[in-house]
């Protein structure tokens, strides 16, 4: 029977006694950067060319023996689960591995560094299709290490890591911590995430996605037909780099910020028990598992957008937060959050000639998180409207007053440090969509954008009661782009988006003891491109 | 069922070019290996080589190398075995047999062929 | 190569008698992996292709009688068929499957006595 791991990434119309997606992904490159591998092995003889580059550390300890089958263990299941015959999950994928780490599992960042670079030549030098770099391993953070990583990224090569099994932060180790690359955390047969011994997956905002990483079948260096369960965010890994393969096999044009978006897109949603996690790591961390697209020929038409949480500001009174996207997404929307509830709201401001999310916190507050919606935009004009704070108790708005502008989120950002405490909400006139309505203390932004075929609408969901939670979610075919809380409520702790879905956040209602201002309203706006579900019927 | 159905017997002259099957049904054909043995008069099983249907990886056993080539057809579930010049001491009866990543061992085999080389 | 020696050649046992057969491979074919020897015996009947009766050295195929088992590990091996029946008359080969060539044992030609 086929691997749980294999069918768990597998949409259910592939599903048959075997798995068999259409294209193995033959027009892509992978390079494994691990130990050495038993290149012979059935499972991968004749996919996988060991280069030759070795750049390890000596084993510790003088008593150590060197097994041949000992020192190929990782990287020769690694190599399996990526593009096996037999359990491999593209199985039409061709891999040059690269020795960074020793028998004992254990590299260097030089090494690593050094093997980067060499692929980076390899690739000038004889320029083939899309290249996949596989990462699976991690140590503590590295700045130059992350600083080669986005280099090679930018050269449009796409990095895939594991998130690390320290049961941690994945931002305070590299590569994981990069964000140009694809980090991933590892989950089990029941969607939970991993626990290897005391540890476990790392988590937290460093991660974009999980996937399968516990009791993954594999060659094993052991002998020419031996298979192997391991577990760790470098199987998980493995399983990504594998359908990034196919992916980029499928669509070999895809950027690293389109692939990245297909990925989460594409992943099974709220299926992790969040609980696992720290609780202040629950909110940051993707409750994705990968997944492959349910066809070859990817959503080219979708508007696809992600969630992207900055560092947290720390506690300090001027503390600000900021929240990026990537080069080539658009930045459509800014919220902020913070588990205290004090904060100074947010704002889009350019940065570098790019817009960026950045959140204040306030005075006594434990600090801010920034959280900025980034999505694929092609040939988007977008700009930020301001309006300072107004003078009319009505309170402050601003809409997209361009030709063809049209909303797709709206931030707020007040100097005060108690922002209109006890008065009554500002209730937006109806049938002005296309404008934030703030406080009148406040300073409104609203993102406006002009892109073909695109159209947005706001969709509001509002609890008279007090409320821990509220949700707003978007139908089918129209895609979150901003998400926030109507005004008035001074309980709300923030707004961020999850998948599809706008959550307002509010303060324990127990603790507040207020009822008067007990009303939480989310504000979604859910934006799609006509445009680009023309194009994509036009290249059927 | 699950079986292997190889080509009839063959009597060739030495010198001449010859291809046997063996088709492969009630299961997924390019999921398994496929390996051929043979079997000299009153002489012991001796491994020849294996194809993977799935993506035609094949690898031969040292003593056949050059001496025989191994292919498959995945769209008609049949592999094969040819030789481009026999030779006497090719006679012999030749199996194929499957075998699968998870059972790595031959749980099926074909009814064998016969091939004789005689001038 | 990894080469299969069995013992005896052959091996004359009268009905309802114990029939044993040895197999010793040149270097070892259990892995510390998988915990598992990757040793398979066959029973080849005259004019019949192979059939696999033991796998992994002890785990016996569905369908093959409880008379035949399997032992050992890492070099030294044994079937053992407890009662021997008319129709157990054939050849049985040993076969390692871990390395290539993969590789069988000369073969134990098994008669009644």
């Known amino acids: 029977s086929i691997p749980w791991n294999l069918e768990r990434i597998t949409p259910p119309r592939y599903r048959a006694d075997e798995y068999q997606p259409p294209d193995g992904g033959s027009l892509v490159e992978v390079y494994l950067l691990d130990t050495s591998i038993q290149s012979d092995h059935r499972e991968i003889e004749g996919r996988v060319m060991v280069t030759d580059f070795e750049n390890v550390p000596e084993e510790d300890g003088t008593r150590f023996h060197r097994q041949a089958s000992k020192c190929d263990s990782h990287g020769t299941h690694l190599a399996g689960v990526v593009s096996g015959r037999d359990a491999g999950v593209a199985k039409g994928a061709s891999m040059r591995s690269l020795r960074v780490l020793n028998c004992q599992g254990k590299g260097t960042v030089s090494g690593t560094l050094i093997g980067l670079e060499f692929i980076r030549k390899s690739q000038l030098v004889q320029p083939v299709g899309p290249l996949v770099v596989l990462l699976p391993l991690a140590g503590g953070y590295s700045r130059v290490l992350n600083a080669a990583c986005q280099r090679l990224a930018r050269a449009g090569v796409v990095l895939v890591t594991a998130a690390g099994n320290f049961r941690d932060d994945a931002c305070l180790y590299s590569p994981a911590s990069a964000p140009e690359v694809i980090t991933v955390g590892a989950t089990n047969a029941q969607d939970q995430p991993v626990t290897l011994g005391t540890l476990g997956t790392n988590f937290g905002r460093c991660v974009d996605l999980f996937a399968p990483g516990e009791d993954i079948i594999g060659a094993s260096s052991d002998c020419s037909t031996c298979f192997v369960s391991q577990s760790g965010t470098s199987q998980a890994a493995a399983h990504v780099a594998g359908i990034a393969a196919m992916m980029l096999s499928a669509e070999p044009e895809l950027t690293l910020a389109e692939l990245r978006q297909r990925l989460i897109h594409f992943s099974a949603k709220d299926v992790i028990n969040e609980a696992w996690f720290p609780e202040d790591q629950r909110v940051l961390t993707p409750n994705l598992v990968a997944a492959l697209p349910p066809s070859t020929h990817g959503a080219g038409w979708q508007l696809f957008c992600r969630t992207v949480w900055s560092a947290h500001s720390g506690p300090t009174r001027m503390a600000t937060a900021v929240a990026r996207c990537a080069p080539d997404e658009e930045l459509l929307s800014c919220s902020s959050f913070s588990r205290s509830g004090k904060r100074r709201g947010e704002r889009m401001e350019a940065q570098g000639g790019k817009l960026v999310c950045r959140a204040h916190n306030a005075f006594g507050g434990e600090g801010v998180y920034a959280i900025a919606r980034c999505c694929l935009l092609p040939q988007a004009n977008c700009s930020v409207h301001t309006a300072p704070p107004a003078e009319a108790s009505m309170g402050t708005r601003v809409h997209c007053h361009q030709q063809g502008h049209v909303l797709t989120g709206c931030s707020s950002h007040w100097e005060v440090e108690d922002l209109g405490t006890h008065k009554p909400p500002v209730l937006r006139p109806r049938g002005q969509p296309n404008q934030c309505v703030g406080h009148r203390e406040a300073s409104i932004h609203a993102s406006c954008c002009h892109a073909p075929g695109l159209e947005c609408k706001v969709k509001e969901h509002g609890i008279p009661a007090p409320q821990e939670q509220v949700t707003v979610a978007c139908e089918e075919g129209w895609t979150l782009t901003g998400c926030s809380a109507l005004p008035g409520t001074s309980h709300v702790l923030g707004a961020y988006a999850v998948d599809n879905t706008c959550v307002v956040r509010s303060r324990d209602v127990s603790t507040t003891g207020s009822t008067s201002e007990g009303a939480v309203t989310a504000v979604a706006i859910c934006c799609r491109s006509r445009h680009l579900a023309q194009a994509s019927q036009e290249l059927q | 069922q699950v079986q292997l159905v190889q080509s009839g017997a063959e009597v060739k002259k030495p010198g001449e070019s010859l291809k046997i099957s063996c088709k492969g049904s009630?299961?997924?054909?390019?999921?398994?290996?496929i390996s051929w043995v043979r079997q000299m008069p009153g002489k012991g099983l001796e491994w020849m080589g294996m194809?993977?249907?799935?993506?035609?990886?094949?690898h031969y056993s040292q003593n056949f190398q050059g001496q025989v080539t191994i292919s498959a057809d995945k769209s008609i579930s049949t592999a094969y075995l040819q030789w481009s010049s026999l030779k006497a001491s090719d006679t012999a009866m030749y199996y194929c047999a499957r075998d699968h990543w998870s059972r790595p061992f031959f749980d099926v085999w074909g009814q064998g062929t016969l091939v004789t080389v005689s001038s | 190569d990894i080469v299969m020696t069995q013992s005896p050649d052959s091996l004359a046992v009268s009905l309802g008698e114990r029939a044993t057969i040895n197999c010793r491979s040149s270097?070892?074919?259990?892995?510390?992996?998988?915990?598992?020897?990757?040793l398979a015996w066959y029973q080849q009947k005259p004019g019949q292709p192979p059939k696999l009766l033991i796998y992994?050295?002890?785990t016996r195929e569905s369908g093959v009688p409880d008379r035949f088992s399997g032992s050992g590990s890492g070099t030294d091996f044994t079937l053992t068929i407890s009662s021997l029946q008319a129709e157990d008359v054939a050849v049985y080969y040993c076969?390692?499957?871990?390395?290539?060539?993969?590789?069988f044992g000369q073969g134990t030609k098994v008669e009644i006595k």
């Open positions: 992994w050295a002890s």
């Open positions: 270097q070892s074919v259990l892995y510390s992996s998988n915990n598992k020897n990757y």
């Open positions: 009630g299961y997924s054909f390019t999921d398994y290996y």
């Open positions: 076969q390692q499957y871990s390395s290539f060539p993969i590789t």
């Open positions: 194809i993977y249907p799935g993506d035609s990886y094949t």
